[in-house]
């Protein structure tokens, strides 16, 4: 009887407690997934913080689905990662897939859910700390001692496949110091540290981080005692500094001493040449003399050498980055208009100093940055408004109407490259000197083309030879041009009608003014800045201004000879008016045929360079 009463009392009490306690409870609080990490992109673990338990036993479960899927999955492993965690093994881990996960907390009063967390394994990588951290004090002879630190990447990381790129960071501090000194080591697994305090005991640690992801924990600290006799032997350093200082001083003194003289003359004194005028282009072909001279403060003045007047006979055609021949009508850019280069309308092109034989450099040999395009960010632009109308100035047509000029606001005229026929070779700019030389001799017509800035001076008044026509020359030519807003915006390829030309004093270079169908070039000598007064185009000194292309030398130099038949023709504008085209053409053909035959016999081989014997020239001309 007593037992029944006792058990009934206990039962009632438990029932009361259960009822009362359950009444006072709440559903669980909201859990939070606070971290997901992968040590190696192959597995990952997520951890959550439980919310309040509501005073009741609460169960937690993690559910997830992959982006694009609706099927929910439950966490595969609640054990491996410890309490309140979910571990995803290899078979559950997919790269480049987003996992959408949520933790569910449930008790007798209800269920609560964490916010959804979006996880991409690529971005949650946190490697294990680096291993086998070794620290050593190295004290080489005659050099400052240093701390040498070496380590290995964490074992789970596969670095060989390129799947991973690990970056490392080292920190060290004297044992009793508060502040850590941090060094970034990049991808290397060893590091040298100088400037240590002798007699101190240092703590060294290393950690790593993948390209996307988090820094690992610091590796266990390694201790190293820095010896007290950790002295510096700076002899080598001082010797190096002294030598370097001496060299710098010598260079400065040398530069100052040579100021005002031609640097080139000092470095490469004039060597007596062969009988006729010519120069060895291979002499400076391999040296970057131009860069050296400008670095030392030497200006690009024309050299005062024995070769001052060579360019009257030898016209050098270069294909440096500063000079381009353009074919507007290419396959890539059909009928694309071109914006003129903004050059100062000055008649001095500056090519004499840039390309004089004494200053010939590697520049001509350098490959083009972009072989298929005319590269100048400010020069070529696709027209914003293709409908824009362009006006032609009727007075600006010369050369028998074949080369149109565009009006530049005043009476000045400038040439612009003509669009090529559609069957033309699609290259939009030439990059081969030999091709150009062939073109010059070849029968094809040659409209003028624009040259870019060369060296410091803009190329302001010159004209180069057009690239070859491979098919038949097309009769119709399509022309596009732009109306320049100011005179300054106009590139001057040809001088104005009334522009005076230089006297027959020693010349630096010549300017091409016309290319006939036969390849005859009209040349005008360019006057040096310090020369005397200019002479009018009609003067007798200008008689030798017309020349024929006689041949192309192996080193890509055009050989030009004076044309005796064109003696009374003063300038290209006047020649177009006065001389009948047929007569001029006839004379040109005869002279060219006569000279070409002779010149082949008169060629001498001198150290890989072709020279032409002037004696032969005179015979052929007589």
């Amino acid at each position: 009887m007593k037992e029944n009463v006792a058990s009934a009392t206990v039962f009632t009490l438990l029932l009361f407690l259960n009822t009362c306690l359950l009444n006072g409870q709440l559903p669980p609080g909201k859990p939070e997934i606070f971290k997901c990490r992968s040590p190696n992109k192959e597995t990952f673990t997520c951890w959550w913080r439980p919310g309040t338990d509501g005073g009741l036993p609460t169960n937690y479960s993690l559910t997830y689905h992959r982006e694009g899927e609706t099927l929910m999955h439950e966490c595969p492993d609640y054990i491996t990662g410890g309490p309140n965690s979910c571990h995803f093994g290899k078979q559950y881990t997919s790269m480049w897939r987003t996992y959408i996960m949520m933790v569910n907390a449930t008790n007798q009063m209800g269920s609560s859910f964490s916010d959804e967390l979006y996880v991409d394994v690529t971005y949650i990588v946190q490697p294990d700390p680096p291993l086998e951290l070794a620290v050593e004090v190295k004290q080489p002879e005659d050099r400052k001692p240093y701390l040498w630190i070496k380590w290995s990447p964490p074992t789970l990381i596969d670095l060989k496949t390129g799947w991973f790129t690990l970056l490392y960071e080292i920190r060290l501090k004297p044992e009793k110091a508060a502040e850590w000194e941090i060094h970034f080591a990049g991808q290397q697994t060893e590091f040298k540290i100088l400037s240590l305090h002798p007699g101190q005991k240092y703590l060294v640690q290393v950690r790593c981080k993948p390209d996307h992801g988090y820094w690992s924990a610091w590796s266990p600290a390694t201790f190293i005692q820095i010896p007290s006799d950790f002295t510096m032997n700076d002899t080598t350093v001082w010797i190096s500094v002294a030598v370097l200082s001496a060299v710098i001083c010598l260079i400065i003194v040398w530069a100052v001493a040579l100021k005002g003289y031609s640097m080139v003359t000092c470095i490469f004194p004039p060597v007596p040449g062969p009988k006729i005028k010519g120069f060895d282009a291979h002499l400076l072909e391999k040296g970057k003399s131009e860069e050296l001279l400008s670095a030392l403060g030497c200006q690009d003045f024309p050299p005062t050498s024995d070769y001052e007047d060579l360019l009257v006979e030898y016209l050098e055609v270069d294909d440096s980055e500063d000079q381009h021949l353009m074919s507007v009508h290419s396959k890539e850019h059909p009928s694309q208009g071109m914006k003129p280069t903004y050059l100062d309308p000055d008649t001095d092109s500056g090519r004499g100093s840039c390309d004089s034989p004494s200053l010939l450099s590697e520049k001509c040999e350098e490959p083009q940055a972009n072989p298929s395009t005319f590269y100048d960010p400010e020069v070529i632009e696709k027209p914003e408004n293709p409908e824009t109308t362009h006006t032609w100035d009727p007075q600006c047509i010369s050369m028998e109407g074949k080369i149109p000029y565009f009006h530049a606001g005043g009476s000045k005229c400038s040439t612009w490259p003509l669009p090529q026929p559609s069957q033309h070779n699609p290259r939009s700019s030439y990059h081969n000197i030999t091709d150009v030389c062939e073109l010059a001799v070849g029968p094809a017509g040659a409209p003028a083309t624009l040259l870019n800035e060369a060296g410091k001076d803009a190329l302001k008044s010159s004209q180069t030879i057009k690239s070859r026509e491979e098919g038949k020359a097309t009769q119709q030519r399509e022309v596009e041009s732009f109306h320049s807003e100011t005179d300054q915006d106009t590139p001057w390829l040809l001088p104005q009608e009334k522009t005076p030309f230089g006297s027959a004093k020693p010349l630096d270079y010549v300017e091409i003014h016309k290319v006939n169908k036969d390849g005859a070039l009209s040349l005008l000598p360019k006057q040096r800045e310090n020369s005397g007064k200019p002479k009018k185009p009609g003067t007798p000194e200008n008689n030798k201004e017309y020349a024929k292309v006689s041949g192309v030398m192996d080193n890509n130099i055009l050989v030009l000879v004076p044309d005796p038949h064109a003696k009374n023709v003063a300038c290209f504008e006047e020649s177009a008016k006065e001389a009948p085209p047929s007569l001029e053409q006839n004379q040109a053909e005869k002279a060219l045929a006569n000279f070409t035959a002779t010149s082949s016999k008169c060629r001498l081989q001198l150290g890989g360079l072709d020279y032409l014997d002037p004696a032969c020239f005179t015979h052929s001309f007589h």
Epitope: N23, S111, D115
Partner: antibody, heavy 116, light 110 residues
């Protein structure tokens, strides 16, 4: 008889504070979780806050988090709601309600009106 | 804006059966039990149904509740004029860590 009686409502300026009280009788107050629920004029019911039987767990609606504090004094069988930084949208009839073991509000007070 | 959706109004003639729906989502109705409250004009709310379909003592058996997935419904059969009131569904929302009430449904007995 099981009963809940609210007090402390009134007119208050925006940004002001007010403390509501709910006196419980007719049941073991310390064994139940207690709630505050409000109802704006002409609108529906909105749960405000809950406190567990011993005061260890408290949950708040997002709209009042950081401004309102729920508390209880089991020795006085009283539930409190401290309202700070009051806004016009807090204007409502405030009810205290008991939470039963099924997670339902089984006993409700008659409410106290708060006008901001 | 309530996380639980109820129709703003419902109506019926005496003796008729009326159903009020309440739809939610997985974090509330989908994973927790639904309660229904009745609020007569000018009075405090009163528990009508708890744990989806349980009636507290004193509530007539004309009131019944049900739940399916993320939706719940309250059915009133044999409609009477005293049933004219506002009805609310409520559930613990695990995402909000709090109780969510539906927007009120005003029942009119024609």
């Amino acid at each position: 008889e099981v009963q809940l009686l609210e007090s402390g409502g009134g007119l208050v300026q925006p940004g002001g504070s007010l403390r509501l009280s709910c006196a419980a009788s007719g049941f073991t107050f310390s064994s139940y979780s207690m709630n505050w629920v409000r109802q704006a004029p002409g609108k529906g019911l909105e749960w405000v806050a809950v406190i567990s039987y011993d005061g260890s767990n408290k949950y708040y609606a997002d709209s009042v988090k950081g401004r309102f504090t729920i508390s209880r004094d089991n020795s006085k069988n009283t539930l409190y709601l401290q309202m700070n930084s009051l806004r016009a949208e807090d204007t409502a009839m405030y009810y205290c309600a008991r939470l039963n073991r099924a997670g339902a509000f089984d006993i409700w007070g008659q409410g106290t009106l708060v006008t901001v | 804006q309530s996380v639980l959706t109820q129709p703003p109004s419902a109506s019926g003639t005496p003796g008729q059966r009326v159903t009020i729906s309440c739809s939610g989502r997985s974090s509330n109705i989908g994973s927790n039990t639904v309660n229904w409250y009745q609020q007569l004009p000018g009075t405090a709310p009163k528990l009508l149904i708890y744990k989806n379909n349980q009636r507290p003592s004193g509530v007539p058996d004309r009131f019944s509740g049900s739940k399916s997935g993320t939706s719940a419904s309250l059915a009133i059969s044999g409609l009477r004029s005293e049933d004219e009131a506002d009805y609310y569904c409520a559930v613990w929302d695990g995402s909000l860590s709090g109780w969510a009430f539906g927007g009120r449904t005003k029942l009119t007995v024609l």
